[in-house]
């Protein structure tokens, strides 16, 4: 069994190295920014929505294109839940320093957890998306 796990880990590692997760990162960042543009963000100052909607985000076409490419990449991990989790963790690691607020970080994690389901894939049951060094608010 140990031997099988070792081979599984190696296979996952090479899958992760081959995968291009950028479209997933681009899709998620566009999605959480689009949501903020729509609903405003800071509950303490509703009259001062910090970001105004931009035509770039309104189009949505770019994001759906990213989502399609993202799903194609995630599809490679469909039969290995642990490896799917590692892919999600890698996405979180790659974007954590872009998220300078608790709300943005939580929303990104929410969307990230939903990503496999959005792609019609099984989501890993237990997948810790906390970033490693420095805890939740590393950047």
């Amino acid at each position: 069994r140990q031997q099988w796990e070792l081979q599984g880990d190696r296979r996952c590692q090479s899958q992760l190295e081959r995968a291009n997760l950028r479209p997933c990162e681009q899709h998620l960042m566009q999605k959480i920014q689009r949501d903020e543009d729509s609903y405003g963000r800071d509950p303490y100052s509703p009259s001062q929505d910090p970001y105004s909607p931009s035509p770039y985000d309104r189009r949505g076409a770019g994001s759906s294109q990213h989502q399609e490419r993202c799903c194609n990449e995630l599809n490679e991990f469909e039969n290995n839940q642990r490896c799917m989790c590692e892919a999600l963790q890698q996405i979180m690691e790659n974007q954590s320093d872009r998220l300078q607020g608790r709300q943005q970080e939580q929303q990104f994690k929410r969307e990230l957890r939903n990503l496999p389901q959005q792609c019609g894939l099984r989501a890993p049951q237990r997948c810790d998306l906390e970033v490693e060094s420095g805890g939740r608010d590393r950047y």
Epitope: Y51, L99, R138
Partner: antibody
Framework: QVQLVESGGGVVQPGRSLRLSCAAS????????MHWVRQAPGKGLEWVAA????????YYADSVKGRFTISRDNSKNTLYLQMNSLRAEDTAVYYC???????????WGQGTLVTVSS | EIVLTQSPLSLPVTPGEPASISCRSS???????????LDWYLQKPGQSPQLLIY???KRASGVPDRFSGSGSGTDFTLKISRVEAEDVGVYYC????????FGQGTKVEIK
């Protein structure tokens, strides 16, 4: 209404220390990264330091590394900048600013003047 | 360290006329997520700076639509379609890809 109010500035001799404070109100202070930015008289803006929302991560400009320490007390909605071994070139108006959540400086205080002179 | 170079450093403008400011970075400001981490700020005389444009082209809330940002990679531009008297001040670009650094500023004044 968002308010960031800096205090603690003044005249200090080279080599001495000073602590700046920034009191925040009207914002979710403990949800966002906070920054210090300074502006020497008649000069441009210089980013000084930043601290993540939980206080775990701190970043500094090379010009202040090892001399300045940024910290925050989320229970008091206050940001601090401890400035040690001050030099004449640290003379500036110091602004605190709140991050937008995406690395932009969204809200700014009015600034406090620090003068380092013998 | 990423260095930002603005030009011109001084820009005399005529109200009603367009104006543009350039900001060049010593390295690309595109993150792997596709966004350019370049902001524009305006500091009006005697005031604190204010955010105008973030992520190269997104206008911050309350900023008039005569302001627009464009560019990608290392070359960025802030355009004012029709300058108004209240637009005078110093404009700064700022990169937020690696920590944060400002350009040296462009002073915009009425001719």
């Amino acid at each position: 209404q968002v308010q960031l109010v800096e205090s603690g500035g003044g005249v200090v001799q080279p080599g001495r220390s000073l602590r700046l404070s920034c009191a925040a109100s009207g914002i979710a202070f403990n949800d966002y990264t906070m920054h210090w930015v300074r502006q020497a008289p008649g000069k441009g803006l210089e980013w000084v330091a930043a601290i993540s929302y939980g206080g775990t991560n701190k970043y500094y400009a090379d010009s202040v590394k090892g001399r300045f320490t940024i910290s925050r007390d989320n229970s008091k909605n206050t940001l601090y900048l401890q400035m040690n071994s001050l030099r004449a070139e640290d003379t500036a108006v110091y602004y605190c600013a709140r991050d937008s959540g995406y690395r932009s400086l969204l809200h700014w205080g009015q600034g406090t003047l620090v003068t380092v002179s013998s | 360290e990423i260095v930002l170079t603005q030009s011109p450093l001084s820009l005399p403008v005529t109200p009603g006329e367009p104006a543009s400011i350039s900001c060049r970075s010593s390295q690309s400001l595109v993150h792997r997520n596709g966004y350019n981490y370049l902001d524009w700020y305006l500091q009006k005389p005697g005031q604190s700076p204010q955010l105008l444009i973030y992520m190269a082209s997104k206008r911050a809330s309350g900023v008039p639509d005569r302001f627009s940002g464009s560019g990608s990679g290392t070359d960025f531009t802030l355009k004012i379609s029709r300058v108004e008297a209240e637009d005078v001040g110093v404009y700064y670009c700022m990169q937020a890809l690696q920590t944060w650094t400002f350009g040296q500023g462009t002073k915009v004044e009425i001719k």
